[in-house]
């Protein structure tokens, strides 16, 4: 192994490490709050956000919000810490490598939401049942 | 072994410029996205800015947007850190850092001091 270079003199208990120790790096996740968006009927859509943020904190993950009521429809772009909820709601699939949006229930609005741990994962929002592992079939695939 | 040596730091007034530079050795350095990190005192690490492996996308965190731009040279094995308009709260010690190593393996950092 590599010997250490001299202690530091800084505080390492501020420092995020993976099980390796390897220091761990924040996403890089689209982040332009929320915007008018024309996705709509759509299987996937791009989220039209030029805006690529380094997340402020390593443990932070890609979080895409797609809400429809009868005025418009908005897609909300951010990067958020799984172990809190956004929304009320829980990040269950933060560590996806993709957006797979999921439905939930919110009085007055058709709302989804998708979470997701790889650089700019939430650029591209996918809404198509074939990617839903909730899906008996696909998880044969998946664990033949 | 993986070496990375920052250099560049001092003293400098508000509003003024420096350029760091931070020497790879002991890996692929032109596979590699790299990153330059820093860290105020008793403060935890702040991501300053991210460079893919072939330097033609970049990214800045917000407080130094517009001020800062990263760029390397996979031919030297350098990367480096243009910083403009310094302000105090720019005082921190620099480090550059890729993927995948511990904090313990990372440089010594160098110290850049805004004060008038």
């Known amino acids: 192994t590599i010997p250490p270079h001299v202690q530091k003199s800084v505080n390492n208990d501020m420092i995020v490490t993976d099980n390796n120790g390897a220091v761990k790096f924040p996403q890089l996740c689209k982040f332009c709050d929320v915007r008018f968006s024309t996705c709509d009927n759509q299987k996937s859509c791009m989220s039209n956000c030029s805006i690529t943020s380094i997340c402020e904190k390593p443990q932070e993950v890609c979080v895409a919000v797609w809400r429809k009521n009868d005025e418009n429809i908005t897609l909300e772009t951010v990067c958020h810490d799984p172990k809190l909820p956004y929304h009320d709601f829980i990040l269950e699939d933060a560590a996806s490598p993709k957006c797979i949006m999921k439905e939930k229930k919110k009085p007055g609005e058709t709302f989804f939401m998708c979470s997701c741990s790889s650089d700019e994962c939430n650029d591209n929002i996918i809404f198509s049942e074939e990617y839903n592992t909730s899906n008996p079939d696909l998880l044969l695939v998946i664990f033949q | 072994e993986v070496q990375l040596l920052e250099s560049g730091g001092g003293l400098v007034q508000p509003g003024g410029s420096l350029r760091l530079s931070c020497a790879a050795s002991g890996f692929t350095f032109n596979d590699m996205r790299m990153w330059w990190v820093r860290q105020a005192p008793g403060k935890g690490l702040e991501w300053v800015s991210?460079?893919?492996?072939?330097?033609?996308?970049?990214y800045y965190a917000d407080s130094v947007k517009g001020r800062f731009t990263i760029s390397r040279d996979n031919s030297k094995n350098t990367l480096y850190l243009q910083m403009n308009s310094l302000r105090a709260e720019d005082t921190a010690v620099y480090y550059c850092?890729?993927?995948?190593?511990?904090?313990?393996?990372w440089g010594q950092g160098t110290l850049v001091t805004v004060s008038s």
């Open positions: 850092a890729k993927d995948g190593l511990p904090f313990d393996y």
């Open positions: 991210v460079i893919n492996a072939d330097g033609n996308r970049t």
